[in-house]
Amino acid sequence: GITIPRNPGCPNSEDKNFPRTVMVNLNIHNRNTNTNPKRSSDYYNRSTSPWNLHRNEDPERYPSVIWEAKCRHLGCINADGNVDYHMNSVPIQQEILVLRREPPHCPNSFRLEKILVSVGCTCVTPIVHHVA
Amino acid sequence: GITIPRNPGCPNSEDKNFPRTVMVNLNIHNRNTNTNPKRSSDYYNRSTSPWNLHRNEDPERYPSVIWEAKCRHLGCINADGNVDYHMNSVPIQQEILVLRREPPHCPNSFRLEKILVSVGCTCVTPIVHHVA
């Protein structure tokens, strides 16, 4: 394996809970700048499995506002603009990492938390269960 | 806005960069359990806008390996199983938080970073530009 030497300038942790509790710089670096000039925010309307976005707010969490996708229909929109129930609109779900204040209401102490969010919807062929 | 009083049991931060640098408990709590009984991981194959997963690795980041969705086709799969180029397969993107070692190779000091990942694809009606 690749062996990377420890940086001699690393901060020491005197915390008795180390390594469970570490220092994290919250000056969030955004690597997304200009990565995708074609990124579109209107797919939720143009998709054959369109979705609505619902606001979920929690002041004890970072990010405090998360927008969740909810598929508009059980089926998918066909070429005529009608809902085709032979196909299914399903949410694409993704686990994301958030920070939760712990203990609650503390401005400088957090815990990492994994939550499941629906990002958008896609149209899939249904799984048909044949009854014997 | 709602004013939440500061918890008197909060840890103090002596760090000169406070509140940019905070204490984070790395014992990741999973809030997903039992939230979604219908969660499926095979949509990437069953979608009318199917996708493949491509590996991106960075040992200084957690998670170090990120599999990104890349749509298989420009068009979408129709009822006959053929690609219909009158529709477009497009990636659904999501901003996620990752942790980066900072300074590099330090085991107990991190920085939060936001990156944009493609988590799946959806089928959309194309935007048609009419030439005058």
């Epitope: 994301i96 | 999973n30 969660r39 690795e57 040992p59 170090s64 390996v65 990120i66 942790l99 070692r101």
Partner: antibody, heavy 126, light 107 residues
Framework: EVQLVQSGAEVKKPGSSVKVSCKAS????????ISWVRQAPGQGLEWVGG????????DYAQKFQGRVTITADESTTTAYMELSGLTSDDTAVYYC???????????????????WGQGTTVTVSS | EIVLTQSPDFRSVTPKEKVTITCRAS??????LHWYQQKPDQSPKLLIK???HSISGVPSRFSGSGSGTDFTLTINGLEAEDAGTYYC?????????FGQGTKVDIK
């Protein structure tokens, strides 16, 4: 190619401790976790605990809490499992396994054990 | 903790036969269920991850299905080399747990 090579068999007295090592090669050590799984003679598999090498943070099964310590040394790409207060019930083959922790298909960090060490037999006998 | 119950405990089969092993979780685990094969005196080997995803190098006769609480491992056309014990494993929540195992031998 990923390889996990474990230390040799150990014979220990009741009440003593054992420390088993798992040397990883192939790929970046901090890109995945290492879990420890044991198998008593003629029995099934039992998860002991695991470590996220990127953070150096370990999680343990409640059953072993307080007498197991899992650590990782990045400089030698080696993980260790130390079990104390040994009894005859701890006689087993101890395996290390790679825990991928990959952002994949809706999961922030996957936890299937894709590569395994060859196993270390620990015998506890007076 | 999440309990995984496999059935059957033991199966004796003839080559080319189809083998089905089930694994039931005591609570919903989504798709976080994996299958391993262990041959005598060998380490376990990952066969299927996340309920239905095949692993590179594993023969295509091995397949998995299910989600929530009920999962199935299928061996389509068993071969002599498939003799061994099969385990399911959940990674939805700590502590990770395994099924008790299903031993498959060849008649």
């Amino acid at each position: 190619e990923v390889q996990l090579v474990q230390s040799g068999a150990e014979v220990k007295k009741p009440g003593s401790s054992v420390k088993v090592s798992c040397k990883a090669s192939g790929g970046s050590f901090t890109s995945y976790g290492i879990s420890w799984v044991r198998q008593a003679p003629g029995q099934g598999l039992e998860w002991v605990g695991g470590i996220t090498t990127f953070f150096g943070v370990a999680d343990y099964a409640q059953k072993f809490q307080g007498r197991v310590t899992i650590t990782a040394d990045e400089s030698t790409t080696t993980a260790y499992m130390e079990l104390s207060g040994l009894t005859s019930d701890d006689t087993a083959v101890y395996y290390c396994a790679r825990d991928p922790h990959e952002f994949w298909n809706g999961y922030y960090a996957t936890h299937d054990f894709d590569y395994w060490g060859q196993g270390t037999t620990v015998t506890v006998s007076s | 903790e999440i309990v995984l119950t496999q059935s059957p405990d033991f199966r004796s089969v003839t080559p080319k036969e189809k083998v089905t092993i089930t694994c039931r979780a005591s609570q919903n685990i989504g798709s976080a269920l994996h299958w391993y094969q262990q041959k005598p005196d060998q380490s376990p080997k990952l066969l299927i991850k996340y309920a239905s995803h095949s692993i590179s190098g594993v023969p295509s006769r091995f397949s998995g299905s299910g989600s929530g609480t009920d999962f199935t491992l299928t061996i389509n056309g068993l071969e002599a080399e498939d003799a061994g014990t099969y385990y399911c494993h959940q990674s939805d929540d700590l502590p990770y747990t395994f099924g008790q195992g299903t031993k498959v031998d060849i008649k």
